[in-house]
Structures are given as structure tokens and as C-alpha cells.
């Protein structure tokens, strides 16, 4: 026997209180698949998060980060502070890359300059905190 709830489309829930008819999701909730017995609470983009896409009855809200921060984790579950190029984020805030390392982005960690001699090459352009070395013949 077919489950009557399977006829309920996205944007609704199968309402047991109303003889399993399909009822619309309440405001600030959604169901992205059919046949659901409840709707899901919409994600709220608050604080350092800002709304990239509003919640609808069939899809959750999507958040990104306010300027000066960038997304981390699946679905932008966290916002991390930006640093300048040539820096990395530590527990004490943004710190300059140590000599011999660089970071050419506003996020991530400082990475060591390329060791040109490993490929039998010489340094053509010196590295900086913001840029890797350029190896030459």
C-alpha cells in the first residue's frame, strides 16, 4: 500500500493532525524533499554571517560572511577573519609570515618558499612574505 505522505511535495509536510493531508510549511521553515512529516527550521544568517540566499518553502537559506571574513566548513558553517597577504591567522590574530615563508591569499597559512636547488635550478626572483620565489635555469 502506498504511503499517502509520499504525495506531499517539497514545501509541505504530511500533516498527521489533518488526516495526512499536505500542509504548507510554516513561515521560516522549509522542506526540500517530498514526503516529509515535518518541515525544517530555516537557517538564520546573523552576526558575522549575512544572507546570500533567502530561505524559501523548498530550500534553506544560504549564508556567507561579512566583509573582512571568509567562509569555512561545509555550507559556510563558520566565518574566519581575513588577514592580509603575507600574513597568517594565529590564536593571537594576524601575524606576518616568518622569513622563508609566504602567503599570497587573505586566508590560509604561510608556506615555505620553493627550494629551487631541489630541481637543479637557481633563484631568479627572490621570495617575499607575499610571493614565492621564481626559479630559473
Amino acid at each position: 500500500l502506498q504511503d499517502p505522505c509520499s504525495n506531499c511535495p517539497a514545501g509541505t509536510f504530511c500533516d498527521n493532525n489533518r488526516n495526512q493531508i499536505c500542509s504548507p510549511c510554516p513561515p521560516n521553515s522549509f522542506s526540500s524533499a517530498g514526503g516529509q512529516r515535518t518541515c525544517d527550521i530555516c537557517r538564520q544568517c546573523k552576526g558575522v554571517f549575512r544572507t546570500r540566499k533567502e530561505c524559501s518553502s523548498t530550500s534553506n537559506a544560504e549564508c556567507d560572511c561579512t566583509p573582512g571574513f571568509h567562509c569555512l566548513g561545509a555550507g559556510c558553517s563558520m566565518c574566519e577573519q581575513d588577514c592580509k597577504q603575507g600574513q597568517e591567522l594565529t590564536k593571537k590574530g594576524c601575524k606576518d609570515c616568518c622569513f622563508g615563508t609566504f602567503n599570497d591569499q587573505k586566508r590560509g597559512i604561510c608556506r615555505p618558499w620553493t627550494n629551487c636547488s631541489l630541481d637543479g635550478k637557481s633563484v631568479l626572483v627572490n621570495g617575499t612574505k607575499e610571493r614565492d620565489v621564481v626559479c630559473g635555469p
Epitope: F13, D15, N17, R18, P26, T38, C39, I41
Partner: nanobody, 122 residues
């Protein structure tokens, strides 16, 4: 026991106004998400308006924005829907609804009353 009793419906001409009331008992409307759903003849339920969160933010369906106003009287534990510039397409049974948040994170709603019939016709 949660009870919701709607009143204030009736027959009104296009462009006219009505105020619906919902007297609640068994819970405190100021501490819950509450609103109005309607069912037009031969159609499914539709959310019309709601007061959400303790901050009292409001939701309105696009079709009623600027014409309907939701409010509540906490002392009387009563929810209202002021409807103006009524149109034929507003004809429906209007139910007071309480949003229910389940332990597993799901959301549904409850309509306990019989609803109140609003008919817009000349």
C-alpha cells in the same frame, strides 16, 4: 489543553474590511509563534500571516502584503487579523494556527478551531 477559537468572519463587499479574532487558551500567545492560515474553496491550506519569535517579527504572504495586518493582545491572549481592501480571491475559511517545534528539530503547525468563513462578494 490548547484551544483556538476564531471569530469575526462574514460576508463583505470587495474593497471592504473585516477583523478576525482568535482567542487562545492552554498556552500564552506572546511566547509562541502564531498566525493565520486559510483554505479557499477547492484549494489547499495557505499561510496568510504570522508573528514569529519573541521579538514579534511578522510574516505576510505576498498576496496580502499592504492589505492585512496581524497583531496580538497579550493581556487578552488573543490574536487578530485586520483585513482591508478585500478581494474575491480572499474568500476562504481562515484558521488560527500555532507553530509547533518538535524535539528532533522539525516544524509543523496546529489548527484546533473550526475556522471562520470570509466571503468577499458583491
Amino acid at each position: 489543553e490548547v484551544q483556538l477559537l476564531e471569530s469575526g468572519g462574514g460576508l463583505v463587499q470587495p474593497g471592504g474590511s473585516l477583523r478576525l479574532s482568535c482567542a487562545a487558551s492552554g498556552f500564552t500567545i506572546s511566547a509562541e509563534d502564531v498566525g493565520w492560515v486559510r483554505q479557499a474553496p477547492g484549494k489547499g491550506l495557505e499561510w496568510v500571516s504570522a508573528i514569529l519569535d519573541f521579538g514579534g517579527s511578522t510574516y505576510y504572504a505576498e498576496s496580502v502584503k499592504g492589505r492585512f495586518t496581524i497583531s496580538r493582545d497579550n493581556a487578552k491572549n488573543t490574536l487578530y487579523l485586520q483585513m482591508s481592501s478585500l478581494r474575491a480571491e480572499d474568500t476562504a475559511v481562515y484558521y488560527c494556527a500555532r507553530v509547533v517545534y518538535h524535539a528532533g528539530g522539525g516544524v509543523t503547525f496546529d489548527t484546533r478551531g473550526q475556522g471562520t468563513q470570509v466571503t468577499v462578494s458583491s
